[in-house]
Interface confidence: low
Amino acid sequence: FERTRSLQDPCSNCPAGTFCDNNRNQICSPCPPNSFSSAGGQRTCDICRQCKGVFRTRKECSSTSNAECDCTPGFHCLGAGCSMCEQDCKQGQELTKKGCKDCCFGTFNDQKRGICRPWTNCSLDGKSVLVNGTKERDVVCGPSPADLSPGASSVTPPAPAREPGHSPQ
């Protein structure tokens, strides 16, 4: 590796993947194993991120870029750069402090992450319920009762009773 030449800043010529080694007369030294520098002129190399435990390696560390992690199956990333992994739940559930819980009656979640959301209220748009909602799926709204041809009928919305075994959360 070349000795740096700039009079203003002797470290400015050190390329990415190296650091300006003050202990060796400001020579550009390669980053040690398991470290990197993503920009030129660095005085230190950063330790590579280690994807351990629930994290798994999506991109290996190189001398010029950090490792990138994602989450093992059954978990999903949260935060910039996948700084956390959160447990997946099944569709029709949401993650609470006590673990995965079924969506309350009248709500649904069609993903493995996130919270249960209320079914669409078709009547607010002057429409009727065409397909009932479930824990996993929102209701499907159909045309308004006035738009239906004579003799046609829509599905009546379910009575607001709780399904057995579904306690409020």
Epitope: S38, A39, R43, T44, I47, R49, Q50, N66, A80, G81
Partner: nanobody
Framework: EVQLLESGGGEVQPGGSLRLSCAAS????????MAWFRQAPGKEREFVSR????????DYVESVKGRFTISRDNAKNTLYLQMSSLRAEDTAVYYC???????????????????WGQGTLVTVKP
Amino acid sequence: EVQLLESGGGEVQPGGSLRLSCAASGWAFGNYGMAWFRQAPGKEREFVSRLAWNGGSTDYVESVKGRFTISRDNAKNTLYLQMSSLRAEDTAVYYCARQRSYSRYDIRTPQTYDYWGQGTLVTVKP
């Protein structure tokens, strides 16, 4: 003792400009990367921009690219954030932070930074 002190916040109309400053003391400012984060009421702290110790590389969150410019004056131990074309969604408390020498995290995550200022409030409203 490491200290970071932000200033320059205030109330401005949409489309206006502000320049935030972060004065550092108690450590070798020129040896560390620095960043700006912001936190709107009821929201998580969000990465805004980061500048390498020597100004050699910059990063911005997508929503501020072309509007905000990060810079530093190592002789004055000061970090700056020039903000223009401000929008209502830029309203937040803005914090400067010092990048750790070593971090296992992405540079946009707060865990990458070890010292933080107290923040300066930026309010954008008509």
